[in-house]
């Protein structure tokens, strides 16, 4: 049978033949007549026989993490039969290790994200090395992993390459650190091989800090006549933390004439003072308010360092701007009685310069042939009014401010023209009647009715009555209604066409005004011919009589 | 802290311009929302606020004596002034500069103020 | 402009006592846009109250300020020595103006 021990051979060596070992057959008695054969991968190029005596050498150097054992066969002849003295048989050679290979880390690179402000123990991340040298002879790969930079901050276990947080840090003072793991095989002997990598560790940032302004005290300036919501400044905090960390809300702290509000611009993080309430600078030409800022989002447990806001004070300076004059009234009402003579005065009317400065007023009518005004506004009449032509006169009153002519404002300006009476009634149409000749006495021949241009206090009341003329001659008569109407009646039996075919009565209308004022008003009255039946045989105004519905007898 | 001292002619003739400067030390007159006025006092009565200036330049006046006041400022020195022009008996008094505060337009440094008599 | 008035004009008090300064401006103004200032003979004044109750830096605390509208005191709760002196208010809002004054002396 063969003889063989278990073959080693140590890798990495220099030598030019190494000898390995011995392979046998028990019955070779050392005579030269056997011949041992090396077959298999490696043979002849990285093991050689001894083919008389069966010794192996190793005649290149071998790399154990390359390839850790050969299996090879072996074969022993007769050289005198030519013939196999034992069966092929299949040997193992092992290389062994040497500690030549350092660690390596094989996932790099390495990076992690960590809070900020994380406590002690905090895993960060954990780093592993690779030892290509045999785990299992000795303390070859055998690992321990240590920190050359990260201190005071990281740790790492030595045996399981965890980093830790071992101090807590501020992303605001400092967002990442370079941590340098080192990685010892031979468990740190001496002899030891290293290898290191980087690990680089990125500060995630939490909201523990709250926006500051920038200043502490701002000026803004404001045009009295800028309308509510104008952007009137913008105001700047600062927050040392990132992205939602930063989102920040202004707002008023104080602000006792609750003029201004600032709203958030939230994507330039700005506070936009605006306008709420208009100002005026004659009113309150200097505003102070107090603003504060707050993180949009802070958690619960962040609370600690947001108990305070942060503010900051806003001058707020009106600036002035010329505005036209203002009067006292937005308009008014003047009463003037009729038929006063020109150069009468109607009322006054006042503007002034709301400005500080106070320029004197001119003022002006629009388009009046009849009114006037002077330079302290008073009104006069530049004609005698008629309440029977103009009742009302709407004027528009214009004041200029004398420093600047731009600066205008107009109000209107009602005047009533009041009546007095100077009008007497007078018939309200004109009336022709008729009469028929055969006519009884007490016969009614036209009701009549007045009008007045005078307007009425209370209710006109009209008087009505003959002439003093008419009332002697005695043919007609009339009697008043007492409502403002009068009839006239034949005062006689019997007239006569061809010898009065027309009569003119001459009548009296007077008013209840004071004084009283009469009219004398003409009637004519038409003499016709009737039938007995009442129809008119002659009479040219027969059919509008008629149609009037009187009726001859 | 900021402390403000004033200078000029202690007399000046009627009709004249009264000119008045302001040196600020402690502080910059440039400093962000302050502003820096003239105030003064006639002999044995109250305070009477002439105007004040920014340190862009930015002045107001009191009203009555709006056409008679000129405010400036000088930055690079760290100064401001005041021109009082056509100047009466009435203009005698002691005149004060001062900056307003950190959270008002009250006044909250003076300067020591100096007596301008109006006289021939 | 607005007018303040101040009163009395002169108010004649023994040190320990409290005494009670008025002011009353001719229109409303905001809480916020008065002061009150001390001046001793031959100073320039020295800013007390602000706003109108906030002292300002190094003002003990025996001044105090209050009101609204029109009307607003400076109290002094126990007068001392160097107390009896001249007092102003001024109001910051419609441009600047002070009050005559209100001379507090030693009865």
């Known amino acids: 049978g063969w003889v063989w021990n278990q073959f080693f051979v140590p890798e990495e060596m220099n030598t030019t033949s190494h000898h390995v070992g011995r392979l046998r057959s028990d019955l070779d008695n050392g005579n030269n007549s056997f011949q041992y054969k090396l077959l298999g991968a490696g043979a002849g190029s990285t093991f050689i026989i001894d083919e008389r005596t069966g010794d192996i050498y190793a005649i290149e150097k071998l790399d154990r993490e390359e390839r850790s054992l050969y299996i090879l066969r072996a074969q022993v002849i007769d050289i005198t039969t030519g013939r196999a003295v034992e069966p092929e048989s299949e040997f193992v050679i092992k290389v062994s290790d040497i500690n030549d290979n350092e660690p390596k880390f094989l996932d790099e690179p390495y990076e992690a994200i960590v809070p900020e402000m994380s406590p002690e123990g905090t895993l960060v991340i954990q780093v592993t090395a690779s030892d290509a040298d045999d785990p299992s002879s000795g303390n070859n790969a055998r690992l321990l992993y240590s920190l050359l930079q990260g201190q005071p901050y990281f740790s790492v276990e030595p045996t399981t390459g965890v980093i830790r947080i071992s101090s807590k840090m501020d992303r605001e003072l400092q967002d990442e650190y370079w941590v340098i793991i080192q990685a010892k095989d031979m468990i740190g002997q001496p002899g030891a091989l290293s290898g290191t990598t980087s690990v680089l560790i990125k500060l995630s940032d939490v909201n523990d800090n709250k926006p500051i302004f920038k200043e502490s005290l701002y000026r803004l300036t404001v045009s009295e006549s800028a309308p509510t919501g104008t952007s009137i400044g913008t105001i700047m905090a600062y927050d040392n933390d990132i992205g939602e960390n930063a989102e920040m809300d202004y707002s008023i702290e104080e602000d006792d004439s609750q003029t201004f509000d600032i709203i958030t611009n939230h994507e330039t993080q700005e506070g936009i003072v605006i306008l709420k309430k208009k100002v005026n600078f004659e009113h309150q030409n200097h505003y102070g308010i107090r603003a504060k800022v707050k993180n949009h989002h802070v958690d619960e447990q962040l609370m600690k360092y947001h108990t305070e806001a942060s503010t900051t004070f806003i001058k707020i300076q009106v600036e002035d701007v010329d505005e036209p004059p203002l009067f006292l009234l937005p308009y008014y009402i003047f009463e003037i009685f009729e038929e006063t003579p020109q150069g009468s005065f109607v009322g006054v009317v006042s503007a002034t310069d709301p400005d500080n400065r106070k320029s004197p007023i001119r003022y002006s009518i629009t388009r009046s042939k009849v009114f006037n005004i002077d330079d302290n506004g008073t009104i006069t009449t530049t004609n005698s009014l008629d309440r029977e032509i103009s009742a009302w006169y709407n004027l528009s009153i214009t004041a200029t401010e004398k420093y600047n002519i731009e600066q205008i404002s107009s109000i209107p300006v009602y005047v009533q023209v009041l009546n007095i009476n100077d009008h007497a009634p007078e018939f309200s149409q004109y009336y022709e009647s008729y009469v028929c000749e055969n006519a009884g006495s007490g016969q009614v021949i036209q009701t009549i009715s007045a009008v007045d241009r005078d307007e009425s206090i209370e209710e006109h009341h009209f008087y009505f009555n003959l002439s003093v003329e008419d009332t002697n001659s005695s043919s007609f008569t009339i009697i008043d209604n007492q409502d403002n109407t009068a009839v006239i009646l034949t005062n006689r039996t019997g007239f006569n066409l061809q010898e009065e075919p027309i009569f003119y009565i001459s009548i009296l209308i007077a008013d209840n005004g004071i004084p009283s004022l009469t009219s004398t008003n003409t009637l004519t009255i038409h003499v016709c011919d009737c039938d007995d039946s009442g129809s008119t045989q002659t009479c040219q105004y027969q059919e509008l009589m008629l149609s009037m519905g009187f009726k001859t007898e | 802290q900021v402390q403000l001292q004033e200078s000029g002619p202690g007399l000046v003739k009627p009709s004249q311009t009264l000119s008045l400067t302001c040196t600020v030390s402690g502080g910059s007159i440039s400093s962000s929302g302050y502003y820096w006025s003239w105030i003064r006092q006639h002999p044995g009565k109250g305070l009477e606020w002439i105007g004040y200036i920014y340190y862009t330049g930015s002045a107001y006046y009191n009203p009555s004596l709006k056409s008679r006041v000129t405010i400036s400022v000088d930055t690079s020195k760290n100064q401001f002034s005041l021109k009082l022009s056509s100047v009466t008996a009435a203009d005698t008094a002691v005149y004060y500069c001062a900056r307003d505060g950190s959270s008002g337009w009250y006044f909250q440094y003076w300067g020591q103020g100096t007596l301008v008599t109006v006289s021939s | 402009e607005i007018v303040l008035t101040q009163s009395p004009g002169t108010l004649s008090l023994s040190p320990g006592e409290r005494a009670t300064l008025s002011c009353r401006a001719s229109?409303?103004?905001?809480?916020?846009?008065l002061a009150w200032y001390q001046q001793k003979p031959g100073q320039a004044p020295r800013l007390l109250i602000y706003g109108p109750s906030s002292r300002a830096t190094g003002i003990p605390d025996r001044f105090s300020g209050s009101g609204s509208g029109t009307d607003f005191t400076l109290t002094i709760s126990r007068l001392e020595p160097e107390d009896f002196t001249v007092y102003y208010c001024q109001q910051y809002g419609s441009s600047f103006t002070f009050g005559p004054g209100t001379k507090v002396d030693i009865k």
């Open positions: 229109r409303n103004i905001s809480s916020s846009y």
